[in-house]
Interface confidence: medium
Amino acid sequence: AGHLEQPQISSTKTLSKTARLECVVSGITISATSVYWYRERPGEVIQFLVSISYDGTVRKESGIPSGKFEVDRIPETSTSTLTIHNVEKQDIATYYCALWEAQQELGKKIKVFGPGTKLIITDKQLDADVSPKPTIFLPSIAETKLQKAGTYLCLLEKFFPDVIKIHWQEKKSNTILGSQEGNTMKTNDTYMKFSWLTVPEKSLDKEHRCIVRHENNKNGVDQEIIFPPIKTDVITMDPKDNCSKDANDTLLLQLTNTSA
Amino acid sequence: AIELVPEHQTVPVSIGVPATLRCSMKGEAIGNYYINWYRKTQGNTMTFIYREKDIYGPGFKDNFQGDIDIAKNLAVLKILAPSERDEGSYYCACDTLGMGGEYTDKLIFGKGTRVTVEPRSQPHTKPSVFVMKNGTNVACLVKEFYPKDIRINLVSSKKITEFDPAIVISPSGKYNAVKLGKYEDSNSVTCSVQHDNKTVHSTDFEVKTDSTDHVKPKETENTKQPSKSCHKPKAIVHTEKVNMMSLTV
């Protein structure tokens, strides 16, 4: 089965710059298929823009200004690139790549889409670091005792742009766990969001990970926030004793003693 | 020019109660095109649901049914037993791939129909309320309540800022909510909830212990041995002196 990956969750540009959006095809030989690009402007219908066929022929939608979009494909790495020249406010949209995928039954085809890349245009000078800053909350003892379950909460703050994806996994497992999240909220010039995961008591002794995808993550890789196993039999610790990494490290472990 | 027009912009559906989405074609006969349905969920993921000629995306055949009403020139998608997973925006789209004449392999989309999922009507359930803290941050966790109407108050004398609560459907078909705030005196913050003309406090759920109000760590777990009394997370994050972790007890 064909699978389309758009590695950029978002792409932030200033006016008149060039944006390059990428689509990686797996499960199908790109040399034997056409790749299509669509855009969804806020409040508008999803619109076909341009396609590139297996033989390199480019087809643009009528009414699309010439020279605005450039599409290419690199068969060697099964990649298609959409280049948007001289970006302007009207280019703000989510851009999807897509392809027709043959089904097992002869003659049956479906069009599958990539996850989309949101093009953001800003005129703001932002702080150097606008990656999501995490704060973690561990289950309250009341919840673990009364409900034989515990809720982990992952708070992410001070990020830009607002496009962010959060999911949860147990350590050493690739299974995505069912979690819940709040809306992304604006705070001054940046955004915040939180996600929470409730697990049964038997899973509290496992390490959990809150995995965050964002354009400005350090090194461009998903940020993993580790939630340590909870010992449900230990109710408290001495509040005077903080447990942290060495003084010049930024990672601080605060053990707070509260009654709820 | 062809236009695909959804019947409604928003369709509220109840868990387990069948729902129907309709999409009419303007300017052309629907029989000249193949109709497709897609769902876009949070995070922009566009998932294929159905294409004419009985083609369904993985996992959709059991719970969805696509159809064409040639007489009314419209496409129909039935959600047979909606669950909270079915929330999202649903798009109809058409193409002529594989048909004779001047065919188009591009999709022409209609505007989306936003499907919101609500729990089915059920007896009223009182919430459980728990407080979680980290530094100046406080979260009030409100679990398993019905109906949805609720007011969550974080009680403190020194508020820095508060955020609107997130209210979502719980896996069991009730509601869960979280409200976050930042407070100078987070240790003294409690949470009170107004629901169904009753007030529920986080203190109602506190675990009662002996007169010291704390269970002391065992001798082998005392605070002189931090490696045993606390767990350092291996969080692969670098933040500006953020309080990364709290063990709320």
Partner: antibody
Framework: QVQLVQSGPGLMKPSETLSLTCTVS????????WNWIRQPPGKGLEWIGY???????NYNPSLKSRVTISVDTSKNLVSLKLNSVTAADTAVYFC??????????????WGQGTMVTVSS | SSELTQPPSVSVSPGQTASITCSGD??????ACWYQQKPGQSPVLVIY???KRPSGIPERFSGSNSGNTATLTISGTQAMDEADYYC?????????FGGGTKLTVL
């Protein structure tokens, strides 16, 4: 500037599994194709295969049955496993990154190379 | 799968122009790249997409590719250019290297 630092054993016995790692520093594994290339002593370069950071792979058909390339994005590293090695696998092994955009078909950054000798 | 053929060695006097060829079936339809490798070192990309130079590579390195042959040209060759040179292209989704050419600066 991205740097690739390789590590792994230098001496192996026939039939063992060769395991090499390539750590990416000052840059991201994300969005790139990561390759392994080898060079027997005094000979030319032979491409082993690539992996996209998300996990999709493509191998040299002549080595496909014995090769596994994997990535660990959390540790920013790329790994090579080559099963059932023989003396013919003695070579310097390089990890290399395919560039972005118009550099997509070229190896723009290389690791320092690891000499692996297979001998009984 | 296609093969790329290079001459085993090429000699040139300092200041002169050296040309190294790389031939393969319909190579002109593909992008060719060139790498320089000095003894005990990793290869360094000197030409990509037939004729483009990465930043930091001197202007004396140039490339062309048409028909069945790609050519790396070093004008005003210097002693420091003495090295092995490898051409590389893709055959479908597989990387193919030439056998390498030893450039000797006399």
């Amino acid at each position: 500037q991205v740097q690739l630092v390789q590590s792994g054993p230098g001496l192996m016995k026939p039939s063992e599994t060769l395991s090499l790692t390539c750590t990416v520093s000052n840059g991201s594994i994300s969005g790139y194709f990561w390759n392994w290339i080898r060079q027997p002593p005094g000979k030319g370069l032979e491409w082993i295969g690539y992996i996209f950071y998300s996990g999709s792979t493509n191998y040299n058909p002549s080595l496909k049955s014995r090769v596994t390339i994997s990535v660990d994005t959390s540790k920013n590293l790329v790994s090579l496993k080559l099963n059932s090695v023989t003396a013919a696998d003695t070579a310097v092994y390089f990890c290399a990154k395919l560039g972005k955009w118009e550099l997509r078909t070229a190896f723009d950054i290389w690791g320092q190379g690891t000499m692996v000798t297979v001998s009984s | 799968s296609s093969e790329l053929t290079q001459p085993p060695s090429v000699s040139v006097s300092p200041g002169q122009t050296a040309s190294i060829t790389c031939s393969g079936d319909k190579l002109g339809d593909k992008y060719a790249c060139w790498y320089q490798q000095k003894p005990g070192q990793s290869p360094v990309l000197v030409i990509y997409q037939d004729s483009k130079r990465p930043s930091g590579i001197p202007e004396r390195f140039s490339g062309s590719n048409s028909g069945n042959t790609a050519t790396l040209t070093i004008s005003g060759t210097q002693a420091m250019d003495e090295a092995d040179y490898y051409c590389q292209a893709w055959d479908s989704s597989t990387v193919v290297f030439g056998g390498g050419t030893k450039l000797t600066v006399l």
